[in-house]
Interface confidence: medium
């Protein structure tokens, strides 16, 4: 595969997968209460997010409140907020940065600086999702932790919601996107003989005979 | 079939500025990025500058505080400027189209203009 | 600033015979060297584009190879024509340099 392919495939993977960190970010299902007791007639579920919990009964009903004071938050939840956000703008950035140094670009100008830019982009997007996989993490170790306490009362049990799933999701998505883009980078900056020469109208490649692109020519 | 002709004076005075054009055929400055390199009587390559497709501009330490590269896309025409020149200056001057990418070459290059820095 | 240098400065060799061209960067460059020749009172020409890769038009005789330090342009069997300066160029980093180049002599 190219590293113009490798590129474009990595950018896809990553927007995707900033996509679905917004979504889990703001889901309010990252933990759901799990009802093991079959004597209680389920009359409503609990979600609980970073930013609200929300109730739903059995009618299908919701009512949803958002967290008053910061302060009042247990620290899983703020830093698992500060964590996320980091992670979704510096996501922001890294699409920036990965646009200015990709192939078919033209902001930041060709040349060997544009490689390193490229490839700094790919990092970004790495470091994104092991950022996001932090907070997923922390809550799925809570989630479990008092799952098994026999301490917590059986309909104060939660389990794992979607919104972790998404999260679980979209970080592997940042990650190999990441990885994608890091490679198409470092193709070219390891293997300069695959960094083909950009055509900007439309982004094709020479022929391995060294025969350009008729297209870029009047 | 891609041509690229450089024009401008044989004789320049030390201390003047040196203009040359570089007319370019068969391609479009648009998409395509232009170098000029030089080469002094019975010495080697000297790259001295580039114009990308984009317009951005890279010069060679060497010359950069004395060098302005500029280009009109509608005549396909790209401008060096060089100014307070020595004899030393005195040298070969190419352009030559560099294939946009990470890592650029010269795949085209015009026939050359002698110029001489001499009073 | 990478610089190149070229090994031997002046090469004499009898038409038919096979000659290697050396080129040495002062730092690792991958395979982002490049070929041209040039010929007396005319200007250069690509010959080989990242160290190895061949150009359409160009003779298959010449060929290029290596990659981070040590690059090698050879000529397998050396016609008359190919009396010239041969040059490497390096565009790992900018500045873009030259080596000083490799005179080929026929004898």
């Known amino acids: 595969m190219g590293s113009a392919a490798l590129e474009i495939l990595g950018l896809v993977l990553c927007l995707v997968g900033w996509g679905g960190l917004i979504l889990a970010c703001g889901l309010p299902m990252w933990q759901v209460t799990a009802f093991l007791d079959h004597n209680i007639v389920t009359a409503q579920t609990t979600w609980k997010g970073l930013w609200m919990s929300c109730v739903v009964q059995s009618t299908g009903h919701m009512q949803c409140k958002v967290y008053d004071s910061v302060l009042a938050l247990s620290t899983e939840v703020q830093a698992a907020r500060a964590l996320t956000v980091s992670a979704v703008l510096l996501a922001f950035v890294a699409l920036f940065v990965t646009l200015a140094g990709a192939q078919c670009t033209t902001c930041v100008a060709p040349g060997p600086a544009k490689a390193r830019v490229a490839l700094t982009g790919g990092v970004l997007y790495l470091f994104c999702g092991l950022l996001a996989l932090v907070p997923l993490c922390w809550f799925a170790n809570i989630v479990v932790r008092e799952f098994y306490d026999p301490m917590t009362p059986v309909n104060a049990r939660y389990e794992f919601g979607q919104a972790l799933y998404i999260g679980w999701a979209a970080t592997a998505l940042l990650m190999v996107g990441g990885c994608l883009l890091c490679c198409g980078a470092w193709v070219c900056t390891g293997r300069p003989d695959l960094s083909f020469p950009v055509k900007y109208s439309a982004p094709r490649r020479p022929t391995a005979t060294g025969d350009y692109d008729k297209k870029n020519y009047v | 079939q891609v041509q690229l002709k450089e024009s401008g004076p044989g004789l320049v005075q030390p201390s003047q500025t040196l203009s040359l054009t570089c007319t370019v055929s068969?391609?479009?400055?648009?998409?395509?990025?232009v170098s000029w390199i030089r080469q002094p009587p019975g010495k080697g390559l000297e790259w001295m500058g580039v114009?990308?497709?984009?317009?951005?501009?890279e010069y060679n330490s060497t010359v950069k505080s004395r060098l302005s590269i500029s280009r009109d896309t509608s005549k396909n025409q790209v401008f060096l400027k060089m100014n307070s020149l020595q004899t030393e200056d005195s040298a070969m001057f190419f352009c030559?189209?560099?294939?946009?990418?990470?890592?650029?070459?010269?795949?085209?290059w015009g026939q050359g203009v002698m110029v001489t820095v001499s009073s | 600033d990478i610089v190149l240098t070229q090994s031997p400065a002046t090469l004499s060799v009898t038409p038919g015979e096979s000659v290697s061209l050396s080129c040495r960067a002062s730092?690792?460059?991958?395979?982002?060297i490049h070929w041209y020749q040039q010929k007396s009172n005319e200007s250069p020409r690509l010959l080989i584009r990242?160290?190895?890769q061949s150009i359409s038009r160009i003779p298959s005789r010449f060929s290029g190879s290596g990659s981070g330090t040590d690059f090698t342009l050879t000529i397998n069997g050396v016609e008359s024509e190919d009396l010239s300066v041969y040059y490497c160029?390096?565009?790992?980093?900018?500045?873009?340099?030259f080596g000083s180049g490799t005179k080929l002599e026929i004898k």
């Open positions: 730092q690792g460059i991958s395979t982002s």
């Open positions: 990242y160290a190895s």
């Open positions: 068969g391609l479009s400055l648009i998409r395509n990025s």
């Open positions: 030559a189209r560099t294939p946009d990418g990470y890592y650029p070459y010269f795949d085209y």
């Open positions: 160029q390096q565009s790992y980093n900018l500045p873009l340099t």
């Open positions: 114009i990308w497709s984009n317009g951005g501009t």
